[in-house]
C-alpha cells in the first residue's frame, strides 16, 4: 500500500544523504487532484534517474520495489485517464531533497483519497 511507498521514499532519502548526487529532477510541487496519476508517473520516471545515477544496489532495489508497489496499487484502481496535465519536461527542476519531499506529498494525496 501507499504507506510502504512512503517508507521506501524515506529509505531512499537516507541512502542518498551519504552520497553526492547533484542531479536536478522534474518535480511537481503543486499537484492538481485531477492530474495526480500523471504526476506520479513523472515522479517514478525521475526516480529511475536517481537509481541510475547512484549506481547503488540498495537504491536500485528500493526504487524498483517502490515502482512495483505503485504499479500494483494503481492497476487495482483500473485505467485512469487524465487530460490537460503537464508533461514531465514542463515541470520545474529541483534538487533531490525537494523532489523527495514533493513525492511524499503526492503519495499522501493518494492516501487521503483512497
Amino acid at each position: 500500500n501507499w504507506v510502504n511507498v512512503i517508507s521506501d521514499l524515506k529509505k531512499i532519502e537516507d541512502l542518498i544523504q551519504s552520497m553526492h548526487i547533484d542531479a536536478t529532477l522534474y518535480t511537481e510541487s503543486d499537484v492538481h487532484p485531477s492530474c495526480k496519476v500523471t504526476a506520479m508517473k513523472c515522479f517514478l520516471l525521475e526516480l529511475q534517474v536517481i537509481s541510475h545515477e547512484s549506481g547503488d544496489t540498495d537504491i536500485h532495489d528500493t526504487v524498483e520495489n517502490l515502482i512495483i508497489l505503485a504499479n500494483n496499487i494503481l492497476s487495482s484502481n483500473g485505467n485512469i485517464t487524465e487530460s490537460g496535465c503537464k508533461e514531465c519536461e514542463e515541470l520545474e527542476e529541483k534538487n533531490i531533497k525537494e523532489f523527495l519531499q514533493s513525492f511524499v506529498h503526492i503519495v499522501q494525496m493518494f492516501i487521503n483519497t483512497s
Partner: antibody, heavy 122, light 112 residues
Framework: EVRLMASGGGLVQPGGSLRLSCAAS????????MSWVRQAPGKGLEWVAT????????YYPDTVKGRFTISRDNSKNTLYLQMNSLRAEDTAVYYC???????????????WGQGTLVTVSS | DVVMTQSPLSLPVTLGQPASISCRSS???????????LEWYQQRPGQSPRLLIY???NRFSGVPDRFSGSGSGTDFTLKISRVEAEDVGVYYC?????????FGQGTKLEIK
C-alpha cells in the same frame, strides 16, 4: 558463459520441507535479481518467487506466499528456495533464473538453470 | 491477477512456413512508467526455457531474426517468419508488469 546450477530436489512427504539451492557462476551475482519458476509434470510454467539484488525485497504469488521463502547469499553466489508445508500440487521441476531488472533495460529472465525435480508424495 | 491467454494451444506448421502465436492479457500490462514488460520464452523438448523476446519486441542476444514480437496494451504476437526443425517446442508469453507475474498456458509448435 552464465551458469546456473539448481540442486536440492527430491522426494518429500506432504507437510514436509525442502531447501533448493542455485549456484551461480560466470557473472556478478549481486548485480542481478533472481527468480524461481516451476513446471508441474506435463504442465506449463508458473512463476514462484523473485528476490532483489541485495535480498531486501521478495515477491511471491498467493499460491506459495507464507510457505515458500526465497533468499540469497551474495558472498556465496547462491540463491535459495525454502519450501515448507509442501503439498502434492507443489510437485514440479524448479528452475532458477537470472532476472534483468528495469534500470538495466527491461525485465526478463535471461538465463535459466537446468531445473531440479521436487516430488511431494506419501 | 493478470491472466495471460495464448492461442492456439497447438500449432502444426510446415517447415519453411510462417507461424504466429497470439497472447492476450486480461488487462493492459502497460505499467505506470509507460513500459510493457511482456516476454516470450521457448522451451524445447527436455530443455530449460530460453528467452526469445523481451519488452514486447526486443530480441534477446543470439536469437535468430526469424523470431519477432509485436503488440501493445492487451494483445501481443510472436511470429516466426520461416519455421525450422529446431523451433519445435512450447512457447510461453509472460508478463512482469504487475505482481503476481504470470505466464500464458503455452503453445506447442510441431512440424506437420
Amino acid at each position: 558463459e552464465v551458469r546456473l546450477m539448481a540442486s536440492g530436489g527430491g522426494l518429500v512427504q506432504p507437510g514436509g520441507s525442502l531447501r533448493l539451492s542455485c549456484a551461480a557462476s560466470e557473472f556478478t551475482f549481486s548485480n542481478y535479481a533472481m527468480s524461481w519458476v516451476r513446471q508441474a509434470p506435463g504442465k506449463g510454467l508458473e512463476w514462484v518467487a523473485t528476490i532483489s539484488r541485495g535480498g531486501d525485497y521478495t515477491y511471491y504469488p498467493d499460491t506459495v506466499k507464507g510457505r515458500f521463502t526465497i533468499s540469497r547469499d551474495n558472498s556465496k553466489n547462491t540463491l535459495y528456495l525454502q519450501m515448507n508445508s509442501l503439498r502434492a500440487e507443489d510437485t514440479a521441476v524448479y528452475y532458477c533464473a537470472r532476472r534483468v531488472s528495469m534500470i538495466t533495460g527491461g525485465y526478463a529472465m535471461d538465463y535459466w538453470g537446468q531445473g531440479t525435480l521436487v516430488t511431494v508424495s506419501s | 491477477d493478470v491472466v495471460m491467454t495464448q492461442s492456439p494451444l497447438s500449432l502444426p506448421v510446415t517447415l519453411g512456413q510462417p507461424a504466429s502465436i497470439s497472447c492476450r492479457s486480461s488487462q493492459s500490462i502497460v505499467d505506470i512508467t509507460g513500459n510493457t514488460y511482456l516476454e516470450w520464452y521457448q522451451q524445447r523438448p527436455g530443455q530449460s526455457p530460453r528467452l526469445l523476446i523481451y519488452k514486447v519486441f526486443n530480441r534477446f542476444s543470439g536469437v535468430p531474426d526469424r523470431f519477432s514480437g509485436s503488440g501493445s496494451g492487451t494483445d501481443f504476437t510472436l511470429k516466426i517468419s520461416r519455421v525450422e526443425a529446431e523451433d519445435v517446442g512450447v512457447y510461453y508469453c509472460f508478463q512482469d508488469s504487475f505482481v503476481p507475474y504470470t505466464f500464458g498456458q503455452g503453445t506447442k509448435l510441431e512440424i506437420k
